[in-house]
C-alpha cells in the first residue's frame, strides 16, 4: 500500500498566557527506503506564510531562520524520523493566537504543506494560580520547607521570578523570598495569617499569585484569668484576687493555642492526675466561702504541652460587730465587744470619744482580748463609779472597712442601751 500525505493533529488548542502546552502530532508521507536518504526536514509555519521565504516557528532544519518571537518557545518534541511532529509551546503569549500549518521536506520529491489540517492555537488570559506545597500541619518552632509552582508552566521562555509575602516572613532575608522554595519556622502569632506566593515572567506583564492561610499548631504560651472581662495580673505564675465573703465569682481562664487546649479548674495545687472541679475554662462560685481561701489552679492541656496558673484567692469580710454590752460587776463596769472579720481586724475602745489604749497606768481601766473560732472578743473593765452619763464605744476595722458600736451609760439606770453604727473607712 502506497503511503500518502497524512497529518494527525488536533484542530484547536487553548492555553493560558505564560503557560505551556504540548500538541501531540504524527504524520506520514510517501517515501521508499530504497531511494537515497536525504535528510528529513519538518516545519511549523504561521498560517498564510509562504514556505519558501517565511521564517518558521519551529523546525529541525538548522539552516532555516526561526521567528525571533517564537525562538526557544516553540519546539519540536519527539523523533521526526518516527514521524512524530509534536509541538511544544512554552510561555504562551497572546500574540501566538492564530492558525499554524505543518510542512515536510525530503530531497527533491517530498515537499508538502498539510494545509487541510491546520492547528488553531488560542491563548487566553492567565487564570491558573500557583500551588503552594508544604507538609501539614505547620508546627510552631519547627522549620518547614514550602515550595511554589505553577501547574502547566515549563522552562521555556524567560525565567519565572517568585516573591513571597506575609507576616510570617518578616525576619527573612529579601533574597530568600525570591526563590520558588523557602524554609519557614512558624511562630504562634503566624497562625491564621496569610502567606502569598506571586509568580511573574521576567520582561512579561503576566503575574499570578496564590494566598494560603497558615494553620500553625502551637502549645499554650500564656494563660490568663479574667474576672468580669478584665485580666488578673500575674506574678510568678500566680494571680491574686481578694474576694468579699459571700460574693458570687465567675472566672474565665484562657490559654490561646491551636488546636484549642483543654481547659480545666482544680481546687488548690493539683497533682497531674487530679480530678477537676470544672471541665471548662469557666469557674463559677455562687457564694465565696472562707473555706475556699487558698485558691484554684487553671490548667491548659495540649498535645504539644501544658501550662497552668495558680489563683490565690484571699477571702475577706468587712468587720461584723456584736456589742458593746455592759454590766456592773464587783470590780466595776464590765463592757464586752465581739467581732469577726477577714483579715483579722484591729479594735479600739473609746470613752466619751477618747481612745483607751492598753491598760491605764492609774489602774482606772483594763482591756483584755481573746479569740475563739472566727470571732474575737475584747473586754473593758472600768474601775470606780460613774460621775455622769457616759458613752462607751468599740470600733473594729481592717483594710476593707470598719464598724463601730456604742452604749450610753446613764447614771442611776441599770438597763444599758446599745447601738451598732457601721462605718466605712
Amino acid at each position: 500500500e502506497k503511503p500518502v500525505y497524512e497529518l494527525q493533529v488536533q484542530k484547536s488548542v487553548t492555553v493560558q498566557e505564560g503557560l505551556c502546552v504540548l500538541v501531540p502530532c504524527s504524520f506520514s508521507y510517501p517515501w521508499r527506503s530504497w531511494y537515497s536518504s536525504p535528510p528529513l526536514y519538518v516545519y511549523w509555519f504561521r498560517d498564510g506564510e509562504i514556505p519558501y521565504y517565511a521564517e518558521v516557528v519551529a523546525t529541525n532544519n538548522p539552516d532555516r531562520r526561526v521567528k525571533p518571537e517564537t525562538q526557544g518557545r516553540f519546539r519540536l518534541l519527539g523523533d521526526v524520523q518516527k514521524k512524530n511532529c509534536s509541538l511544544s509551546i512554552g510561555d504562551a503569549r497572546m500574540e501566538d493566537t492564530g492558525s499554524y500549518f505543518f510542512r515536510v521536506e525530503r530531497g527533491r520529491d517530498v515537499k508538502y504543506s498539510y494545509q487541510q489540517n491546520k492547528l488553531n492555537l488560542e491563548v487566553t488570559a492567565l487564570i491558573e494560580k500557583p500551588d503552594i506545597h508544604f507538609l501539614e500541619p505547620l508546627e510552631s518552632g519547627r522549620p518547614t520547607r514550602l515550595s511554589c509552582s505553577l501547574p502547566g508552566s515549563c522552562e521555556a521562555g524567560p525565567p519565572l521570578t517568585f516573591s513571597w509575602t506575609g507576616n510570617a516572613l518578616s525576619p527573612l532575608d529579601p533574597e530568600t523570598t525570591r526563590s520558588s522554595e523557602l524554609t519557614l519556622t512558624p511562630r504562634p502569632e503566624d497562625h491564621g495569617t496569610n502567606l502569598t506566593c506571586q509568580m511573574k515572567r521576567q520582561g512579561a506583564q503576566v503575574t499570578t499569585e496564590r494566598t494560603v492561610q497558615l494553620n500553625v499548631s502551637y502549645a499554650p504560651q500564656t494563660i490568663t484569668i479574667f474576672r468580669n472581662g478584665i485580666a488578673l495580673e500575674i506574678l510568678q505564675n500566680t494571680s491574686y484576687l481578694p474576694v468579699l465573703e459571700g460574693q458570687a465569682l465567675r472566672l474565665l481562664c484562657d490559654a490561646p493555642s491551636n488546636p484549642p487546649a483543654h481547659l480545666s479548674w482544680f481546687q488548690g495545687s493539683p497533682a497531674l492526675n487530679a480530678t477537676p472541679i470544672s471541665n471548662t475554662g469557666i469557674l463559677e462560685l455562687r457564694r465565696v466561702r472562707s473555706a475556699e481561701e487558698g485558691g484554684f489552679t487553671c490548667r491548659a492541656q495540649h498535645p504539644l504541652g501544658f501550662l497552668q496558673i495558680f489563683l490565690n484567692l484571699s477571702v475577706y469580710s468587712l468587720p461584723q460587730l456584736l456589742g458593746p454590752s455592759c454590766s456592773w460587776e464587783a470590780e466595776g463596769l464590765h463592757c464586752r465587744c465581739s467581732f469577726r472579720a477577714r483579715p483579722a481586724p484591729s479594735l479600739c475602745w473609746r470613752l466619751e470619744e477618747k481612745p483607751l489604749e492598753g491598760n491605764s497606768s492609774q489602774g482606772s481601766f483594763k482591756v483584755n482580748s481573746s479569740s475563739a473560732g472566727p470571732w474575737a472578743n475584747s473586754s473593758l473593765i472600768l474601775h470606780g463609779g460613774l460621775s455622769s452619763d457616759l458613752k462607751v464605744s468599740c470600733k473594729a476595722w481592717n483594710i476593707y472597712g470598719s464598724q463601730s458600736g456604742s452604749v450610753l451609760l446613764l447614771q442611776g439606770r441599770s438597763n444599758l442601751g446599745t447601738g451598732v453604727v457601721p462605718a466605712a473607712l
Epitope: N228, D254, P256, A424
Partner: antibody
Framework: QAYLQQSGAELVKPGASVKLSCKAS????????LHWVKQRPGQGLEWIGM????????DYNERFKSKATLIVDKSSSTAYMQLSSLTSEDSAVYYC?????????WGQGTALTVSS | DVVMTQSPSSMYASLGERVTITCKAS??????LSWFQQKPGKSPKTLIY???RLVDGVPSRFSGSGSGQDYSLTISSLEYEDMGIYYC????????FGGGTKLEIK
Amino acid sequence: QAYLQQSGAELVKPGASVKLSCKASGYTFTSYWLHWVKQRPGQGLEWIGMIHPNSGSTDYNERFKSKATLIVDKSSSTAYMQLSSLTSEDSAVYYCAKTFYYFDYWGQGTALTVSS
Amino acid sequence: DVVMTQSPSSMYASLGERVTITCKASQDINSYLSWFQQKPGKSPKTLIYRANRLVDGVPSRFSGSGSGQDYSLTISSLEYEDMGIYYCLQYDELYTFGGGTKLEIK
C-alpha cells in the same frame, strides 16, 4: 497596633433588626473580651454586654438582654451585635471596645438611626 | 445593680487650676474603677484604671484615688486639651458608667 473597625452608619425602620459589625486587627482576636457600649445623642455611656471570642462566653446588662445579641466570627476576626425590635430609643452611636487590664482600644462608633 | 453617681455634672475651670471630679458607688466596688475622657465626636479614652493606675501615655497631671464607695479623678493643672466629658466606670459587678462630667475652660 490593635484596631477596631466598625461598620458604617445605619438608617432603619422601627420594628426592624440590624446587625452591627466590629472587625478586629493587629492583635489576637480570640484572646480578649469585646464589649459594646451605647451612647444616645448628647447622653452618657451605657454598657450593653461583652463576649469572649475564644470561649463564646457572654455577659449582658440586664436592660439589653432581650434587645442585643452578641456573636463573633473567629475566621474573620469580627464581632457582631444584633439589635432587634428597634424603636427610636435605640437611635444612638454604638461602640465596640476591647479590654485586657482596662478598655484599651475602641472602635470609631456606628451611628444607628431608627426612623420611619 | 451598682449605681454610680458622678459629680459635678458640669463645671468650668481656669487653665492651670486643680480640678477634681468624684464618683460614688452604691456599694463597695473594691477599687474596680476606671476614668475616661471623651471629646466631641470621638470614642472614649481610658485615663485611669483600678482606681489609681495611670494608663501608659496619659499625662501625669491626671491621677485617681479612692476606695470602697468613693473615688475621685484629679487634674493637677488644667490644660486646654483637657476639656471634654469625663466618665467613671465601675467593673466590680458587670459594668456601670457614671453620668459624666462636662469640663469646660473658663
